[in-house]
């Protein structure tokens, strides 16, 4: 069962999934100037059996200018930077993931993919939040959201994370700010 909505947004925070439940779809989106190849699937699908899960279909992008070619187009410096970030994020995600039964890992990047990935999550999916660079957690309660089915409707639980840019913490003497969840987690979705 697909979740009706996107996970909740938290100001100055991003979310990511550590692994994707079977049934999750990832749109095959291409960066500006590129489009999905004509015979290409519009999405990748996490499928599996009892022992192994993987992404069905492969996303492929081709230059909008080209007719029927998947010729490599050298990206501009700005595009190279964006692509490098995406590749680095994917590598980190693969590195920091353990295999969860019934879940797929982060799919590797494809040539000329869009900078932001659009996932369609299923019931039972968990996503994790952290404050973006330059902001800190004022309060870190459960910093995750789970897509649940209640009364025949899907809803995401509300993460209890508050991020602030205020620098001087007004804390109790001797108390430290709670530890953020492991830093360097790639940020697959930005909520602001």
């Amino acid at each position: 069962e697909l979740c009706d909505d996107d996970p909740p947004k938290i100001t100055h925070a991003t979310f990511k999934a550590v692994a994707y439940k079977e049934g999750t779809m990832l749109n095959c989106e291409c960066k500006r100037g590129f489009r999905r190849i004509k015979s290409g699937s519009p999405y990748m699908l996490c499928t599996g059996n009892s022992s192994h899960s993987s992404w069905d279909n492969q996303c492929q992008c081709t230059s909008s200018a080209a007719r029927n070619t998947t010729k490599q187009v050298t990206p501009q410096p700005e595009e190279q930077k964006e692509r490098k970030t995406t590749e680095m994020q994917s590598q980190m995600q693969l590195a920091d993931q353990v295999s969860l039964p019934g879940h797929c890992r982060e799919p590797p990047p494809w040539e000329n993919e869009a900078t932001e990935r659009i996932y369609h999550f299923v019931v039972g999916q968990t996503v994790y939040y952290q404050c973006v660079q330059g902001y800190r957690a004022l309060h870190r309660g459960p910093a995750e959201s789970v897509c649940k089915m209640t009364h025949g409707k899907t809803r995401w639980t509300q993460p209890q994370l508050i991020c602030t840019g205020e620098t001087e913490p007004s804390q109790f003497p001797g108390e430290e700010e709670p530890q953020a969840s492991p830093d360097g987690l790639p940020e697959s979705e930005t909520s602001r």
Epitope: K9, H12, L138, G141, P159, P169, Q171, E175, E177
Partner: antibody, heavy 115, light 107 residues
Framework: QIQLQQPGAELVRPGVSLKISCKGS????????MHWVRQSHAKSLEWIGV????????IYNQKFKGKATMTVDKSSSTAYLELARLTSDDSAIYYC????????WGQGTTVTVSS | DIQMTQTTSSLSASLGDRVTITCRAS??????LEWYQQKQGKSPQLLVY???TLAEGVPSRFSGSGSGTQFSLKINSLQPEDFGSYYC?????????FGGGTKLEIK
């Protein structure tokens, strides 16, 4: 069930300070930040600030800096709002409210400042 | 600070009516918006969060919509217990601010 318990009413003299309590029960107190909100006839609802029940770290509405001080006592699952140098303008109902979306509220403490 | 404006301060309606209460933000707040109901002498109660998600236990006749700067709360088929004041509030960034409220009265 989830409850935020506050004293019902406080009558105080001008110029003094007052500390209002808000005791959380029925949930893990440190999972949810605590907000404080003021309601007066003149100004509807006003957000005073928010405090982390885990770390004691707080953010204040600029308007209430110097007037309000928020603290927490984790051992008793209680949040406090201290109001300094009270004047008749501070007469209002003060609420505590839980979490990012203010999903549960205390019943409110009616503060009357009068000589 | 972000201003939240509820242009209608009071509204009269009859049982069974469909009512819409609106709220405007002075800048784009995406969907960082809540709606609360408050009855006389009681504390506010969360109805809708993140602009359109119904809080637990809230009847399905309530619905929230909108994004950016324009938001609305709809009540289908008014019930006796729906009369009271309704407030919108943003949690986009501090300081969080509330609308002035809309008082819903029996016609």
């Amino acid at each position: 069930q989830i409850q935020l318990q506050q004293p019902g009413a406080e009558l105080v003299r001008p110029g003094v300070s007052l500390k209002i309590s808000c005791k959380g029960s029925g949930y893990t107190f440190t999972d949810y930040a605590m907000h404080w909100v003021r309601q007066s006839h003149a100004k509807s609802l006003e957000w005073i600030g928010v405090i982390s029940t885990y770390s004691g770290d707080a953010i204040y509405n600029q308007k209430f800096k110097g007037k309000a001080t928020m603290t927490v006592d984790k051992s008793s699952s209680t949040a406090y709002l201290e109001l300094a140098r009270l004047t008749s303008d501070d007469s209002a109902i003060y609420y505590c409210a839980r979490g990012v979306t203010f999903d549960y509220w205390g019943q409110g403490t009616t503060v009357t400042v009068s000589s | 600070d972000i201003q939240m404006t509820q242009t209608t301060s009071s509204l009269s309606a009859s049982l069974g009516d469909r009512v819409t209460i609106t709220c405007r933000a002075s800048q784009d707040i995406s969907n960082y918006l809540e709606w609360y109901q408050q009855k006389q002498g009681k504390s506010p109660q969360l109805l809708v969060y993140n602009a359109k998600t119904l809080a637990e236990g809230v009847p399905s006749r309530f619905s929230g919509s909108g994004s950016g700067t324009q938001f609305s709360l709809k009540i289908n088929s008014l019930q006796p217990e729906d009369f009271g004041s309704y407030y919108c509030q943003h949690h986009y960034d501090t300081p969080y601010t509330f609308g002035g409220g809309t008082k819903l009265e029996i016609k």
